[in-house]
Interface confidence: low
């Protein structure tokens, strides 16, 4: 009888202990769930900073290459360029890197998608019109909205194979390129209108080692 009581006590203790372990485990799991939310928030915030940096650099570039810059005095232009270069320098001091975790297939898809965009970028100087329509078809392949033109099916299947974060980056890059091409078009039309000449103003260098 005494032995039975002892066993019961031991079992009770063991039960209490495993109950508190489960409790502790669920609390830790809860903490990790909350941390996961914060980690994702951190990544989103860093990505937002990364995007803001890209946008700022693009805006500085577009100011430096705007038509207005051509229609002011050399002294003013020099002063504005100095300010723009200073701002660019300050922007470039911000280093943000959000690494995307990819499996080998996603890695391959990203490489392939990047190669396709680079190919189009390298054609910019030869044929702006063609490059624009090509980029539009690539962009349509990334867009969830109803496409306004032909969709590059091959590119679409490649992009679908990319990590979600990479898909967003690819879409953003294409948006930037299309914006730049738009600006190029305007600059060319303005130049053709003013002196019948063409200009190429797309800032996209696959080998820019010094910038």
């Amino acid at each position: 009888m005494a032995q039975a009581k002892i066993n019961a006590k031991a079992n009770e203790g063991r039960f209490c202990r495993s109950s508190s372990m489960a409790d502790r485990s669920s609390r830790l799991l809860e903490s990790l769930d909350q941390l996961e939310l914060r980690v994702e928030a951190l990544r989103e915030a860093a990505t937002a900073v990364e995007q803001e940096k890209e946008i700022l650099l693009e805006m500085i570039h577009s100011i430096q290459n705007s038509q207005d810059m051509r229609q002011i005095s050399d002294g003013e232009r020099e002063e504005l360029n100095l300010t723009a270069n200073r701002l660019m320098g300050r922007t470039l001091t911000v280093e943000v890197s959000v690494e995307t975790i990819r499996n080998p297939q996603q890695q391959e898809s990203l490489k392939h998608a990047t190669r396709i965009i680079d190919e189009v970028v390298n054609k910019f100087l030869d044929d702006l019109g063609n490059a624009k329509s090509h980029l539009m078809s690539l962009y349509s392949a990334c867009s969830s909205e109803v496409p306004h033109g032909p969709v590059d099916q091959k590119f679409q299947s490649i992009v679908i194979g990319c990590a979600l974060e990479d898909q967003k980056k690819i879409k953003r890059r294409l948006e930037t390129l299309l914006r730049n091409i738009e600006n190029s078009d305007k600059a060319i039309k303005l130049l053709e209108h003013s002196k019948g000449a063409g200009s190429k103003t797309l800032q996209q260098n696959a080998e820019s080692r010094f910038n």
Epitope: H61, Q64, N65, N81, N85, M88, V121, N122, F124, L125, S199, K200, T201, L202, Q203, Q204, N205, A206, E207, S208, R209, F210, N211
Partner: antibody, heavy 122, light 112 residues
Amino acid sequence: QVQLVQSGAEVKKPGASVKVSCKASGYSFTDYTFYWVRQAPGQRLEWIGYIDPYNAGNTYNRKFKGKVTITVDKSASTAYMELNSLRSEDTAVYYCARGYYRYGGGGDFDYWGQGTLVTVSS
Amino acid sequence: DVVMTQSPLSLPVTLGQPASISCRSSQSLVHSNGNTYLHWFQQRPGQSPRLLIHKVSNRFSGVPDRFSGSGSGTDFTLKISRVEAEDVGVYYCSQNTHIPPTFGGGTKVEIK
């Protein structure tokens, strides 16, 4: 065809400044960057710096910071290099060379100007 | 700065014979983008340097095929298969991977 034509030889007194020009033709001026290189007597070639005519952004060799200013005039398809506070050690032939292609590979010293001899002597 | 060391300093050659110039860099010239920006130039007496080979082994347009470049990492070679009279001059290697770009001290090729 691609041509880079530099301004003529200069003789300057110590302490003075000199501005060397390099006019480009035969290609789209803003598509390639510009390098400046010097060759002093008995010395190896030295890279001074470069400028990107597209946005006038430039980078200098640490050794020449404060000594050199590189600029461009897009309307004249011309790059300039100004040397200030000249000393006898600045006596050299100064070359401009076409830099890298902004839209991909290529470029990188593929065409050179004929050189400008700058002599600093009292 | 990356130091480029060329050898020999002087290279007397017989017309029609091969010639070889070595160039060594103080650090690897492989850029993070995968390219190796090692170039070779020829400077004839009284002339500007002229690009012969770019990115280790690519002959520039108009350069005779007797000129070839090879190498990787830190060790590179320029070869002239059969030297001609017009090949006389100073040959320079140059790296454009790291800032600032730097040049070798030159190798003077002369006819024996």
